[in-house]
Amino acid sequence: EPTMYGEILSPNYPQAYPSEVEKSWDIEVPEGYGIHLYFTHLDIELSENCAYDSVQIISGDTEEGRLCGQRSSNNPHSPIVEEFQVPYNKLQVIFKSDFSNEERFTGFAAYYVATDINECTDFVDVPCSHFCNNFIGGYFCSCPPEYFLHDDMKNCGVNCSGDVFTALIGEIASPNYPKPYPENSRCEYQIRLEKGFQVVVTLRREDFDVEAADSAGNCLDSLVFVAGDRQFGPYCGHGFPGPLNIETKSNALDIIFQTDLTGQKKGWKLRYHGDPMPCPKEDTPNSVWEPAKAKYVFRDVVQITCLDGFEVVEGRVGATSFYSTCQSNGKWSNSKLKCQPVDCGIPESIENGKVEDPESTLFGSVIRYTCEEPYYYMENGGGGEYHCAGNGSWVNEVLGPELPKCVPVCGVPREPFEEKQRIIGGSDADIKNFPWQVFFDNPWAGGALINEYWVLTAAHVVEGNREPTMYVGSTSVQTSRLAKSKMLTPEHVFIHPGWKLLEVPEGRTNFDNDIALVRLKDPVKMGPTVSPICLPGTSSDYNLMDGDLGLISGWGRTEKRDRAVRLKAARLPVAPLRKCKEVKVEKPTADAEAYVFTPNMICAGGEKGMDSCKGDSGGAFAVQDPNDKTKFYAAGLVSWGPQCGTYGLYTRVKNYVDWIMKTMQENSTPRED
């Protein structure tokens, strides 16, 4: 606790002090007082610089004195042998003795008292800006008239702050202008205009005289303008050094005038006014501004319209124009919006075709669709080339935005059939010779693929099993081969309405309208071993003449086996219907006259014993297209016969083209349309 006075004695005083001692005393008097320390007795071993034994007086970091030896008072009326006066309220006294003393030394006696200090005169730095008043234990500052004491209780200033200017026009000047401004003051003026107006400050050079800068270029007195995060100034000197017109780009401006203790000049005077906040005429690429003006200010509205092929993307919605308003902050609303090239996006993929990954999907880019050749071709034309249009769609010159459609190429086998040796009397064939060939496992029969979703077969094949299992793409019908081939799942079987259903199909003698369609659940993927056969055209070009050659294929009965394991095929000529009538039925279930022959039937065979037989039913009788020799069409379907190895009867497909097309159209999925 601070004390007003106290006594300090060396160890054992007045007896001799011991060797090897170090003792310190921390003296503290109340704040606002100094310390008067005086010694009334001093008897300490003398040495040079008091190196052996000493009493040391320290104030802060300063050594006020170091004492040793013997002292006596110079004044007979005073017992003081040594004294110290410090203007601080703390002092440290340290006594040290070394390991030996040649004589007996008694040490020292000292006293301290708190003394008043004159803060107004005792220090180099004057504590008050104007008037300083000392009192015992402290001081206070005071000010001349019209000045007030700042919160720091040391500095006086003029009360020149707090004014807020809200009018759209006005004038502000330094205190007492044009008389000298007050020293040691900080004047703050605030201009606060309505949002959307910027403060514009106007000065004349001659209306400004403020104490000049020091040699380092720092203003001693200064005028500063602060608008948000922008600062103009500090300014000082004779004549205004800054721009005479200051556009602050803000509706709020703080004016700060700071003066020091010396060098008062006449000060300054300025005018200000509020301008509607200008917005820059921005260069927005690929767009047009409406209305077009040389200058845009607060509350102006423009419509920015994108050029063709450009759009504004906001979130997920694309637009061709947007509105922008000049805002109170001098910035355009919707400034983030830009007219970007229309992006048509990644082009949609198409079934059985592909589109090369485009380098760009922006306006003007070009892509090309191609079909998986040679198994598919582009049905709806247009060449497959699309460009990214201004509306954001990929557009083709012919089809517009409609996508190309890749449909199977029909009637083109990957490898042509070659008869290797003399079905009955036929040759081994490969599925690539007859990629349209479908195998039905129950009953053991055939069919012809006519497109992705449809299989054509004989009505008698499916009348007893409306959920047939079918396979495509395999030359062999051995189980391991079928397991690797494509199994087709039926969705629905459509038997021709003219086909007569019988209680006992085994006794059938009428095979008229022996035709059926099987709609598949899933589309068939075409390739070298799976590909459809064409349908006949309706023109007379597709009327068969006697002697016209056709190909049959299947896994039916051969000379050696009841059922063939590997696909067999034969080339047969068309024959007159009477040739089929003339052949005696091998195992008749009725009179020969009971068997029905109609124009819906084709008779073929009779050459070298080549014929279709049991198990080949439903397979195609494929004839070269008269208008395109590279293609085959299904002229007939294996239907029935009087005797294997002679002549066979085939359903005349041309007579059913209308029914086939109608059935397919009425039972197509949207994907097919």
Epitope: T475, S480, K560
Partner: antibody, heavy 119, light 107 residues
Amino acid sequence: EVQLVQSGAEVKKPGASVKVSCKVSGDTLTELSMHWVRQAPGKGLEWMGTFDPEEGETIYAQKFQGRVTMTEDTSTDTAYMELSSLRSEDTAVYYCVTEGEAGRPFDAWGQGTLVTVSS
Amino acid sequence: DIQMTQSPSTLSASVGDRVTITCRASQSISSWLAWYQQKPGKAPKLLIYKASSLESGVPSRFSGSGSGTEFTLTISSLQPDDFATYYCVQYPSYSWTFGQGTKVEIK
């Protein structure tokens, strides 16, 4: 109707080889795929391998890889299965079996050949 | 190779019982699974092919079901002639593999 006639029973010493034949009648071997299946006494059926005429390659079960060889002589319609480095665990009835059609795994089975491996 | 796990290995049942044998494939085999019946000293006889198709000449009390990896052979009413060992076999592509067999014996 296909018939398969296999060679007679064999007794072999460990380390030796055995060659079992299977003669096809009622059909030609070229029209068929021949499989070989074995059955150890009191044990289950084990598929050994087959000749795949479509690919013209022989496929063996992993277990017999390197020890079994299946061959065919189409001129005599005879299939052969040779198993080498015989051990006692190879004692079994060996069947030749034709592959079925239209989803049936096996069609005709031979009468079986008992191979006994004993020292 | 695809593994076939057949269960149970042995099954005791009486004439007239409904019997179910299960076969599990280590990976999907679609419907390429058959069931064979074997009697001592005889070659196996095909009952069911393609998981559920009944071979001609096989009594209708035998039925098969399942696809993918889980398959079942059911004998709706066990007859004296049905006491035998039953095997499943998978054949979607080479290699083919048999189950270890289920022996159906008289209780």
